[in-house]
């Protein structure tokens, strides 16, 4: 267990807009050393978002997740207290980060900065990697359900954290609630891969759960207020596509934000399926400022591939 200096693993430059708690599975608080306090939310698609702890919806979401975690515990759910370095999940899940999320490499002077191009939410889903919260992030304690990414979770734009493939140095996020559908928030966060000492009082508990039968695509997001976007039928769809750039507004404006995707599975930015317009309610991709994910690719041992966020643009065809 590490007992070194607690380092700010995740910094948030933007806060996400509203995300339904139904799409959230866990939350954590960033470290005090980060300066600006933020809540890091994880969606059922294992996407991370930065949220403002002062906002009522964030308070309500945390309460809801806490209740769920408590209910799980009462029903036999088990918690695994993890201090220091948390072992990553073994199963990769789709993951992505919002523009405002940045992963900081652990102890290496170098880092690669990603400037993701807009990626389709579906493409993100296709990534099959799940973001892991670095250790040192405190969170609600709860059991984590199987890290199976579900449909893309939509979320406010510009506040989603990038998903990071599980790496030995990455800490697993604790899930405060069972997997539930939830939009991905757009929050820029910098996540350092280096394990940091976690204050026991801020430790999050993680419940181990079975791995998904297969990688699920990253959460997709419709651009709220823009009507449904087509659903792509090609192979890059949900399972192979990633989140789309989103707005930084509320849930309805959750359009995916451009995010850099750290995926174990390289995803081509081309071939993003175009979706046919859907009856309604899909987000159109809005490219926002790219999120910069700084991390040492070698350390992660994964390919960091920016994926264009086009899901919102094409939901189903």
């Amino acid at each position: 267990q590490h007992h070194g200096v607690t380092k700010c693993n995740i910094t948030c430059s933007k806060m996400t807009s509203k995300i339904p708690v139904a799409l959230l599975i866990h939350y954590q608080q960033n470290q005090a050393s980060c300066g600006k306090r933020a809540i890091i939310l994880e969606t059922r698609q294992h996407r991370l978002f930065c949220a403002d702890p002062k906002e009522q919806w964030v308070k309500d979401a945390m309460q809801h997740l806490d209740r769920q975690a408590a209910a799980l515990t009462r029903n036999g759910g088990t918690f695994e207290k993890q201090i220091g370095e948390v072992k990553p999940r073994t199963t990769p899940a789709a993951g992505g980060m919002d523009e405002s999320v940045v992963l900081e490499p652990e102890a290496t002077g170098e880092s690669s900065s990603l400037e993701p191009t807009p990626s389709s939410q579906e493409a993100q889903r296709a990534l099959g990697t799940s973001p892991e919260l670095p250790t040192g992030v405190t969170g609600s304690s709860g059991t984590r359900l199987p890290p199976t990414p579900k449909a893309q979770d939509g979320g406010p734009v510009g506040t989603e954290l990038f998903r990071v493939p599980p790496v030995s140095t990455a800490a697993t996020w604790q899930s405060s609630a069972p997997h539930q559908p939830g939009p991905s928030l757009w929050a820029e966060a910098k996540t350092s891969e280096a394990p940091s000492t976690q204050d026991p009082s801020t430790q999050a508990s993680t419940a181990s759960s079975p791995a998904p039968e297969e990688n699920a695509p990253s959460e997709g997001q419709r651009v709220w207020g823009q009507g449904q976007s087509p659903r792509p039928e090609n192979s890059l769809e949900r399972e192979e596509m990633g989140p789309v750039p989103a707005h930084t507004d509320a849930f309805q404006d959750w359009g995916p934000g451009s995010m850099a995707h750290v995926s174990v599975v390289p995803v081509s930015s081309e071939g993003t399926p175009s979706r046919e317009p859907v009856a309604s309610g899909s987000w159109t991709p809005k490219a926002e400022e790219p999120i910069h994910a700084t991390m040492d690719p070698q350390r992660l041992g994964v390919l960091i591939t920016p994926v264009p966020d086009a899901q919102a643009a094409t939901r189903r065809q």
Epitope: A22, L23, T148, P212, E213, E214, G220, R238, E239, F251
Partner: antibody, heavy 119, light 107 residues
Framework: QVQLVQSGAEVKKPGASVKVSCKAS????????IHWVRQAPGQGLEWIGW????????KFNERFKGRTTLTRDKSTNTAYMELSSLRSDDTAVYFC????????????WGQGTTVTVSS | DIQMTQSPSSLSASVGDRVTITCRAS??????LAWYQQKPGKAPKFLVY???TLADGVPSRFSGSGSGTQYTLTISSLQPEDFATYFC?????????FGGGTKVEIK
């Protein structure tokens, strides 16, 4: 275009089970949640649960946990909802629906499958 | 669970009338509300999401508004094809719940 086509009407006896299918087309099946909603005669709508076709993981309304099974067959782009230990108050139209990934509202619906439970 | 209460349960109106349907949630659903229209023997049709965003192809005479626990669906000028039953649905938290429905009938 997105389409959800459900299986035909069923008449079952109390205590029996029923399995309703929902075949999806027009989009990538594994990318969107499939939800099941029921509507008793002259009543409102009740959410049963969802399944994520990508990995087969389900989530249920607690009211239906224990006697509802949600599955899918990716090779045929079909989702299934099986309800066991049927009672007369399970008589309803069962709908499958799918929605965006940024929130679970339902933009596409199947035509509905009427399940009648009667002795 | 969040309960959704719709009112009125039914109303009679004439073509051209302005109609307002209310949906009240037992807790704050943060605008994660959808509205559907259903005609006899048919599946619901998606109208509005996120409290006020119209689904594709939905006429502009429909509008949604509200916040917190109170939401409304307004039809500015009722048309013959609008006579149907309307349901609200919250998608803030699971289990997703629907209002009991409002039947809009011809006066």
């Amino acid at each position: 275009q997105v389409q959800l086509v459900q299986s035909g009407a069923e008449v079952k006896k109390p205590g029996a089970s029923v399995k309703v299918s929902c075949k999806a087309s027009g989009y990538t099946f594994t990318n969107y949640y499939i939800h099941w909603v029921r509507q008793a005669p002259g009543q409102g709508l009740e959410w049963i649960g969802w399944i994520y076709p990508g990995d087969g993981s389900p989530k249920f309304n607690e009211r239906f946990k224990g006697r509802t099974t949600l599955t899918r067959d990716k090779s045929t782009n079909t989702a299934y909802m099986e309800l066991s230990s049927l009672r007369s108050d399970d008589t309803a139209v069962y709908f499958c629906a799918t929605g965006p990934t940024d929130g679970d509202y339902f933009d596409y619906w199947g035509q509905g499958t009427t399940v009648t439970v009667s002795s | 669970d969040i309960q959704m209460t719709q009112s009125p349960s039914s109303l009679s109106a004439s073509v051209g009338d302005r109609v307002t349907i209310t949906c009240r949630a037992s807790g704050n659903i943060h605008n994660f509300l959808a509205w559907y229209q259903q005609k006899p023997g048919k599946a619901p049709k998606f109208l509005v999401y996120n409290e006020k965003t119209l689904a594709d192809g939905v006429p502009s005479r429909f509008s949604g508004s509200g916040s917190g626990t109170q939401y409304t669906l307004t039809i500015s000028s009722l048309q013959p094809e609008d006579f149907a039953t309307y349901f609200c649905q919250q998608f803030w938290s699971t289990p997703y719940t629907f209002g009991g429905g409002t039947k809009v009938e011809i006066k």
